[in-house]
């Protein structure tokens, strides 16, 4: 096709691809009608003057994953139609001034994964049509003022994975069309007030994996179109009360891996579009009332791996659309019976790895759509009667690694587990911790010959202990699941405790080590 070099493949669609370690210079002659040229995985170390002079129709040029360390200023002369230029994954340390001169049509410039030490305003001063500039994965330590001043049409700028320690508040001031700004994996310790003020069309701001300790109160106040804000893995210890106040379009906010100790009510919002909030790996110790009340559309709230020991009953007010709540690996000992009452659409709740000693009987009373509950590795000895009875969609319940007390009071839980087993995951079985003669034995195969109470007391109406989807109605209106009177009233009040008689001889039980936990 108009003379395709032997080291390359050329297609009818005017696409040329030259690959292989044997290539040490730009192959010639290149087809004059080439519109796309890819030079990949070669041993080319430098680009001399005008190697692409005769292919002026070129629109896309990818010179990636080579040994390229030096480029002559006139290397891209005569490529006035070029719209896409990638020099990514090479060994460039320096860009010659004027390298991109004459590339009047250039829209995408990829310089990522090189060894660039600095950029200067003159580098991009001719690239007035540039929309995308990728500089991530270099060795940049600072960005001089004016570096991007001529890139008024830029919509995407990636400066991630460099060595930036500070950002001038003026460096982005002319980028009014910028939609994506990525500064992740640098060494930024703070962002000056006003740094993002000119970015009125910004939709994504990635600041994760820096060393930011403090956020200025008005840092994001001009970014009304921001949709995704990544602040994870920094050193943020507190959030100024108004820092997120002007972000009505935000739908994703990550704050995990910081040093947050507390969250004040109203800190988030109003953010009517926020769908996910990631707060794990912080030092949060308590959640006050209404702390998330502005997040009406939140679907995922991740609060795991903190130090939460107290959750106010109204902490989750307003989260009517929440689907997933992760509270695992905290320091919870008790939960208020109403704490999840507002979470009518909750599907998955993770409470494992806490210190929960008991659960209120009405803890899941209004959360009828729950599909998964993780309660493993707590201090639970038993669960209230009927706690799961109304959860017709539950298909994963994890209860192992708790010190279950296998006396007669465990029978309702044991029966519930047995009668509902086809709907539950085949996870590790709950194992008895006490009394001593049943320790290590499976809760669902303990011997259940229960002694009769010596004094007959009329039974108090209890929570119905029915399996899911019973074939006949399981609880009449008189025993409503949300009835707090029933939750607090004892089920049976015998004068002597009934106990489960169990043989402690493992060989008689035929227990394997796996079964005995």
């Amino acid at each position: 096709y108009h003379g395709c070099p032997s080291e390359c493949t050329c297609s009818r669609a005017s696409q040329v691809e030259c690959t292989g370690a044997r290539i040490v210079a730009v192959p010639t002659p290149l087809p004059w009608n080439a519109m796309s040229l890819q030079i990949l995985n070669t041993h080319i170390t430098e680009l001399n003057e005008s190697p692409f002079l005769n292919i002026s129709a070129l629109i896309a040029l990818r010179i990636e994953k080579n040994e390229l360390s030096r480029i002559t200023p006139g290397a891209f002369r005569n490529l006035g139609s070029l719209r896409y230029l990638s020099l990514a994954n090479n060994k460039l340390q320096v860009l010659p001034i004027g390298l991109f001169q004459g590339l009047d049509s250039l829209e995408s410039l990829l310089l990522s994964s090189n060894q660039l030490l600095q950029i200067q305003p003159a580098h991009f001063s001719q690239c007035s049509n540039l929309k995308e500039l990728q500089l991530h994965g270099n060795h940049l330590e600072y960005i001089p003022d004016g570096a991007f001043d001529h890139l008024v049409g830029l919509t995407k700028l990636n400066l991630g994975k460099n060595s930036l320690t500070h950002i001038s508040p003026r460096v982005f001031q002319h980028l009014g069309n910028l939609q994506v700004l990525r500064l992740y994996e640098n060494r930024l310790t703070d962002i000056p007030m006003g740094t993002f003020d000119g970015l009125v069309n910004l939709q994504e701001l990635a600041l994760q994996q820096n060393q930011i300790g403090l956020l200025s109160p008005g840092l994001f106040h001009n970014n009304h179109n921001l949709q995704r804000l990544y602040l994870s893995n920094n050193h943020i210890s507190q959030l100024p009360p108004s820092v997120f106040m002007q972000l009505p379009q935000l739908n994703r906010l990550t704050l995990f891996g910081n040093s947050l100790k507390e969250l004040s009510p109203g800190i988030f919002g109003p953010m009517p579009n926020l769908r996910e909030l990631w707060l794990y790996d912080n030092h949060i110790s308590s959640l006050p009332d209404n702390v998330f009340s502005n997040l009406r559309q939140l679907q995922v709230l991740i609060l795991s791996r903190n130090q939460i020991s107290f959750i106010s009953p109204g902490a989750f007010n307003g989260l009517t659309e929440l689907r997933e709540l992760s509270l695992h690996t905290n320091a919870l000992q008790d939960l208020d019976g109403n704490v999840f009452r507002m979470l009518a659409n909750l599907q998955n709740i993770s409470l494992q790895n806490n210190r929960l000693r008991q659960l209120p009987g009405n803890i899941f009373a209004n959360v009828n759509g729950l599909m998964a509950i993780q309660l493993q590795n707590n201090q639970l000895e038993n669960l209230p009667l009927g706690i799961f009875d109304h959860l017709g969609k539950l298909c994963e319940l994890r209860l192992y690694d708790n010190p279950w007390r296998c006396d007669s009071d465990i029978l309702p839980l044991r029966n519930w587990l047995l009668l509902n087993q086809p709907r539950l995951g085949t996870d590790t079985v709950p194992v008895c911790f006490s009394p001593a003669n049943v320790r290590g034995q499976s809760l669902i195969i303990i011997n259940v010959n229960v002694a009769v109470p010596s004094v007959h007391v009329p039974e108090v109406p209890s929570y119905p202990e029915t399996p899911w989807y019973p074939d006949t109605p399981s609880y009449p209106d008189t025993t409503s699941v949300s009835s707090t009177t029933e939750l607090t009233s004892p089920v049976e009040d015998y004068t002597d405790l009934t106990t489960i008689q169990v043989t402690d001889d493992r060989s008689v039980w035929g227990m394997t080590q796996a079964q005995s936990g």
Partner: antibody, heavy 113, light 111 residues
Amino acid sequence: QVQLQQSGPELVKPGASVKMSCKASGYTFTSFVIHWVKQMPGQGLEWISYIYNDGTKYNERFRGRATLTSDKSSSTAYMELNSLTSEDSAVYYCARDYYFDYWGQGTTLTVSS
Amino acid sequence: DIVLTQSPASLAVSLGQRATISCRASESVDYYGISFMNWFQQKPGQPPKLLIYAASNQGSGVPARFSGSGSGTDFSLNIHPMEEDDTAMYFCQQSKEVPYTFGGGTRLEIK
């Protein structure tokens, strides 16, 4: 000790209904499942249904013809069978707990015109 | 429904010897790492009696000569040593899922 005392034998006509009982003693009635099992003369065992605190599960083969109820005050479980045919002639057992650890002595039902 | 197939249909064993009855399920009866297979003994004119539950756990008051083993789909009941009193029908039963089903039975007698 745990006991399940079932009602006496029944002789009924085809198309009629019967209600048999199973009175539990020696344990807390509400803490255990009660199953009902059918055994035709000289044949195997067939699970019908269970009841636990008013919730029931049925074998599809008996749904609509068997109805389980219980009276907690007297620790008694009941099974009613309707639209009886000669195929329903059998011994009907009640049994306690998920694992059927104690059984009643059985109620013999004869359906004959 | 889970179908349980017992074998043999009848078995004669000498006193003091070992009797082995097998039960194969049409699908696994395991859950939570536990096999929900139970064994019952029934003598003429009497209700069944629970011998073994969850594959290998003895019912209350059941002599130690009765033992159960197996997992997944294949299970067995062992009686050793065989005694006169062990002449009866033996049924396996799965309680993994509704409808709970029984095997067809094995008649065990003294040789």
